[in-house]
């Protein structure tokens, strides 16, 4: 079965520059299939733009300005590239690659899509570091004791653009865990988002990872934020203790680590 | 030119209650085309659901049913038992791949229908409220409540900033919420929640500790760390009266 990966979740360009969007085809030989590119502008229908067939023939949708889009494919890397020249804000859109995939039964085909790349056009260059800055929150003791479960929260701040993907995994496991997240929120000229994962007590002694994909991650690789295991011992509980606590009665353990 | 027009821009559905999406074709007979349905979820992933000739995407056959109403010139997609996973934008699209005549292998899309999923009506459930802290950051975690209407207040005299709460459907079909804020006096911040004409405080859920060593990160070396902007700290900590642990990276 054909599978399409678009490694860039977003691509930010300033006006008049050239954008190159990649699509990696697996499970099928790129030289034996056609690759299609679609565009979804905000508030508009998804529209076919251009395709490159197995024999290298390029077909463009009528009404698309000539010279704006270029499509090619590199069999060695099984990649198709959509090049958008002289970008303007009209080009802001999510771009999808797609291909027809034959089903087991003869004559049955479906069109599968890549995950899309959002093209973001800015008037001005970005600041030097607009990658997501993480802060972690570990489960409150109250939750682990009362509910035999614990919630990890991964806060990401001061990133640009707003396109971000977050998922959670246990250490030494590739299984994606069921998590929940808030909307991406604008704070001044950057964005913030948080995601949380609730795990049963038996998993609290395992290390968990909050994995973040963002265009401006250092070296272009996913950022992994490590949540250390939690050791839960026997505890005396008084859930209804509403007396005001002295500020010194609680020690907040905060580990700070900075890296270049 | 043909146009595919969804019946509704937004369709609210309840968990487990069947829902129907309709998409009409303007300018042509729907029988001259193959109809496809796709779902776009958060993060823009476009997943194939259904194509005429009884073709379903992986995992969709049991819970979805595609149909064509030739007389009304429209396509129908039924979600038989919606779950929170079915939230997203649903698109109808057509093509003529494999039909004689003018050969077109491109898809023509209609505008999306946003499907929002709500929990099924159920008895009211009081939330559990917990506070998590890290430096100036405070998170109020509100778990397993119904109905959705809720007011979350982080109580502090020294607020820096607060964010709108995130309210989502919990795996059990109720609601969970998180509200974040930044405060100069984060140690003294508490959370109070107004729900169903009652107030629930995070302090109702706090615990007294006899242990001096019950929350501790494993002592690990800073090696083989793939993260670019965070490193796993080597932690040797003496904890007294710890009721939460946090790590700033």
């Amino acid at each position: 079965a054909g599978h399409l990966e678009q490694p860039q979740i977003s691509s930010t360009k300033t006006l008049s520059k050239t954008a190159r969007l990649e699509c990696v085809v697996s499970g099928i030989t790129i030289s034996a299939t056609s690759v299609y590119w679609y565009r979804e502008r905000p508030g508009e229908v998804i529209q076919f733009l251009v395709s490159i067939s197995y024999d290298g023939t390029v077909r463009k949708e009528s009404g698309i300005p000539s010279g704006k889009f270029e499509v090619d494919r590199i069999p060695e890397t099984s990649t198709s590239t959509l090049t958008i020249h002289n970008v303007e804000k009209q080009d802001i859109a999510t771009y999808y690659c797609a291909l027809w995939e034959a089903q087991q039964e003869l004559g049955k085909k479906i069109k599968v899509f890549g995950p899309g790349t959002k093209l973001i056009i800015t008037d001005k260059q970005l600041d030097a570091d607009v990658s997501p800055k993480p802060t972690i929150f570990l489960p409150s003791i109250a939750e682990t004791k009362l509910q035999k479960a614990g919630t990890y929260l991964c806060l990401l701040e001061k990133f640009f653009p707003d396109v971000i993907k977050i998922h959670w995994q246990e250490k030494k496991s590739n299984t994606i865990l069921g998590s929940q997240e808030g909307n991406t929120m604008k704070t001044n000229d950057t964005y913030m988002k948080f995601s949380w994962l609730t795990v049963p007590e038996k998993s609290l002694d395992k290390e968990h990872r909050c994995i973040v994909r963002h265009e401006n991650n250092k070296n272009g690789v996913d950022q992994e934020i490590i949540f250390p295991p939690i050791k839960t011992d026997v505890i005396t509980m008084d859930p209804k203790d509403n007396c005001s606590k002295d500020a010194n009665d609680t020690l907040l353990l905060q580990l700070t680590n900075t890296s270049a | 030119a043909i146009e595919l027009v969804p019946e509704h821009q937004t369709v609210p559905v309840s968990i487990g209650v069947p829902a129907t999406l309709r998409c009409s074709m303007k300018g042509e007979a729907i029988g001259n085309y193959y109809i496809n349905w796709y779902r776009k979820t958060q993060g823009n992933t476009m997943t194939f659901i259904y194509r005429e000739k009884d073709i379903y995407g992986p995992g969709f056959k049991d819970n979805f049913q595609g149909d064509i109403d030739i007389a009304k010139n429209l396509a129908v997609l039924k979600i038989l038992a919606p779950s929170e996973r079915d939230e997203g934008s649903y698109y109808c699209a057509c093509d003529t791949l494999g039909m004689g005549g003018e050969y077109t292998d491109k898809l023509i899309f209609g505008k999306g229908t946003r499907v929002t999923v709500e929990p099924r009506s159920q008895p009211h459930t009081k939330p559990s409220v917990f506070v998590m802290k890290n430096g100036t950051n405070v998170a109020c975690l509100v778990k397993e409540f119904y109905p959705k209407d809720i007011r979350i207040n982080l109580v502090s005299s020294k607020k820096i900033t607060e964010f709108d709460p995130a309210i989502v459907i919990s795996p059990s079909g109720k609601y969970n919420a998180v509200k974040l804020g930044k405060y100069e006096d984060s140690n003294s911040v508490t959370c109070s929640v107004q729900h169903d004409n009652k107030t629930v405080h995070s302090t109702d859920f706090e615990v007294k500790t006899d242990s001096t060593d019950h929350v501790k990160p494993k002592e690990t070396e800073n090696t083989k760390q793939p993260s670019k902007s965070c490193h796993k700290p080597k932690a040797i900590v003496h904890t007294e009266k710890v009721n939460m642990m946090s790590l700033t990276v």
Partner: antibody, heavy 124, light 107 residues
Framework: QVQLQQSGPGLVKPSQTLSLTCAIS??????????WNWIRQSPSRGLEWLGR?????????DYPISVKSRISINPDTSKNQFSLQLNSVTPEDTAVYYC??????????????WGQGTMVTVSS | DIQMTQSPSFLSASVGDRVTITCRAS??????LAWYQQKPGKAPKLLIY???TLQSGVPSRFSGSGSGTEFTLTISSLQPEDFATYYC?????????FGQGTKLEIK
Amino acid sequence: QVQLQQSGPGLVKPSQTLSLTCAISGDSVSSNSAAWNWIRQSPSRGLEWLGRTYYRSKWYNDYPISVKSRISINPDTSKNQFSLQLNSVTPEDTAVYYCARESGSYYTDGFDIWGQGTMVTVSS
Amino acid sequence: DIQMTQSPSFLSASVGDRVTITCRASQGISSYLAWYQQKPGKAPKLLIYAASTLQSGVPSRFSGSGSGTEFTLTISSLQPEDFATYYCQEFNSYPYTFGQGTKLEIK
């Protein structure tokens, strides 16, 4: 509030260099949420954007192709001002020249603060 | 470059009138458009950005609409201080072209 004060000669000879300065008060030329522009206006050409300078971890400039080869816009952080230099002027460059602020870190919403304008005549 | 064409070039109206000025772009510019007001001897003043967002401090009688290639600036009830020249400007692509202007005069 933010104000822009322009200064510079009103008469320039053909083939020489037009130089104007725009002093900023109430904001910083090094702000990472603004850009500093020059715009001119003449009866024959109407309003015409000439370019900008701005700081985002380092200094950047943008110029339209029509003047790119002979224009330079430079910040002066010590005086909190920015300047325009237009080389090899001709009578076609006769216009009212404005400096203007464009707010927004990465996107442009328009020119929200303008200088008072300087009438520059190119004539021998 | 994108051409921005305003119509009419001249417009006579009376205090209290509702007036509409149109701006057409030679190609689609989505909503990347601003409107300015300019009085004789003065610098232009930003009224509206992103096609329809009112700049802070601008009276609510001014409104903007449109997207793609056709845009309008509407003044719901003309005041004496509104007689001026109005310009549109696109921010879709360099070089951020302005319209030629619409001069609004007292009838």
